[in-house]
Structure formats: C-alpha cells, structure tokens
C-alpha cells in the first residue's frame, strides 16, 4: 500500500514523523532542496515536545530548520500558520542583522547552540534536519 | 516494474512554452505524490515541483513559481508539468520523479533547452 507504518532506514520515527539530521552543512536553499528530493520538508516546529526531541537529536549545533522570510512575512515550509503557531526565539530574536558584511539581512532561522530559534544568513553551512508525516513516507515493493 | 517515461522536451526560444508528459506504469499511480526534478549542465540535481496523489495540493520551488505549472491524470497515469516564460536558466534534463523517503523511482528524463 502507499502508507507507511515505520520510518525509512536512517529515519527517526516521532509522533507519526520521520527526521533525518544531517551530519554535514548546507546553505538553507541547498538543504531545503535536499530535503524536498526525499519528498519531504525541512523540519517544521510546531510544539515544545517537538522542538525539545529535535533538541535532543541535533545536540549544540546550528542547524537549520523550514522556517524563512525571504520573500518579506517569516513562513513555514509546509504552509503551516506563523503568527499563530509555535515560537522558540532567543531574546530580541529574529533581528535581520545586517552587520555581518555578507550583503541583506538575516532571511533564514536556524536552532542555536541552546536550541532557542536566530536568524541568519541564508547561505551560511549549518547542518539540517529534514520531516515528513509517517504515512506519506511510505514506499510500496517494487513489483516484479 | 515500475516504470517512469518522460516526454515533451525539445529547443525553445526564451519566453516560449513546453508541456512535458510523464507515463507511469507498474504502481498505483493515484496513490501517490509525484514530483519533477531536472539536473541543469554540470549541476546538481533541483527539485522543481510536487503534486499531491488527488491533484489538489501543488508545490514549486521559487525559481519556477509562477511560471511552472504541475497537474495529473490519474485515469491514464500520466503526470504534466506546464512550463511557460521559459528562461535560459531553465535549461536541463526534466525527470518525471516517484520520491519517497530513503527510496526513489525515476525516469530517464527528457531534455528541455533554451536558447535563442
């Protein structure tokens, strides 16, 4: 059938979802593409149990999540509601800093080395974590 | 055997059109996401758009937003993609994509060039 019941091998199953966290950096657009290639979505935070489980995965480590405004409002990758949803900032975050010389502001969030929430330069090389919902990650046998 | 099979490609001038075809065979088709991809010269592979298995729900990555459009028919198992304003950047092999986590089904691809 087409749902899933278990998480793909290297795939951690939570709360009928699948993570995968990279162990090498990416600019934001590159692990958002990457992720999309799995036929899933950079990781959406949508509760506190949820961020502390990733918390606990990705460890002290900037590591980027699904969420970015880049096109003006921040947004979630998968649609889901910012202003209404779940946020973990560090204080006077987000700040679209444009002190660091590298050109624009700060477009893309990212996990801190305490888990809260920064903005940042899109193309900086952070780790990534990829989601999808259990039952859509599921892959029937091939037929033969 | 699941079987993925590209058509549509060919030369365009820039702000011209094309309507690529993917026939799909060897799985139920209307169970599930299907996507495209393309892999420009001497790049990586890009993730360009996804349909969700009833047609209802569409996804585009921002480069082709606007302009790209997927669609589907489930009775002949085929998958579409649109692709209007097509600009030199869009050049690339077009692959109709079976994606799932931790396992892919692909086709051969169909190239798309743009040029003047």
């Known amino acids: 059938g087409s749902e899933r019941t278990c998480c793909p091998v290297n795939w951690v199953e939570h709360e009928r979802s699948c993570y995968w966290f990279s162990r090498s950096g990416k600019a934001w657009a590159d692990a958002d593409n990457y992720c999309r290639l799995e036929d899933a979505h950079l990781v959406v935070v949508t509760s506190w149990e949820e961020q502390k489980f990733v918390q606990h995965h990705i460890g002290p480590v900037n590591t980027w999540m699904g969420l970015h405004d880049q096109n003006g409002p921040w947004k979630w990758v998968d649609g889901t509601d910012y202003e209404t949803g779940f946020k973990n900032w560090r204080p006077e975050q987000p700040d679209d800093w444009y002190g660091h010389g590298l050109g624009g502001g700060e477009d893309c969030a990212h996990f801190t080395d305490d888990g809260r929430w920064n903005d940042d330069v899109c193309q900086r090389p952070y780790r990534w974590v990829c989601e999808t919902e259990l039952d859509k990650a599921s892959q029937e046998p091939p037929l033969l | 055997e699941v079987q993925l099979l590209e058509s549509g490609g060919g030369l365009v001038r820039p702000g011209g059109s094309l309507r690529l075809s993917c026939a799909a065979s060897?799985?139920?088709?209307?169970?599930?996401?299907m996507s495209w991809v393309r892999q420009a010269p001497g790049k990586g592979l890009e993730w360009v758009s996804s349909?969700?298995?009833?047609?209802?729900?569409?996804y585009y990555a921002d480069s082709v937003k606007g302009r790209f459009t997927i669609s589907r028919d489930n009775s002949k198992n085929t998958l579409y993609l649109q692709m209007n304003s097509l600009r030199a950047e869009d050049t690339a092999v077009y692959y109709c994509?079976?994606?799932?986590?931790?396992?892919?089904?692909w086709g051969q691809g169909t190239l798309v060039t743009v040029s003047s």
């Open positions: 994509a079976k994606l799932r986590a931790g396992f892919d089904y």
């Open positions: 060897g799985f139920t088709f209307s169970a599930y996401r």
């Open positions: 349909i969700g298995k009833d047609g209802n729900v569409t």
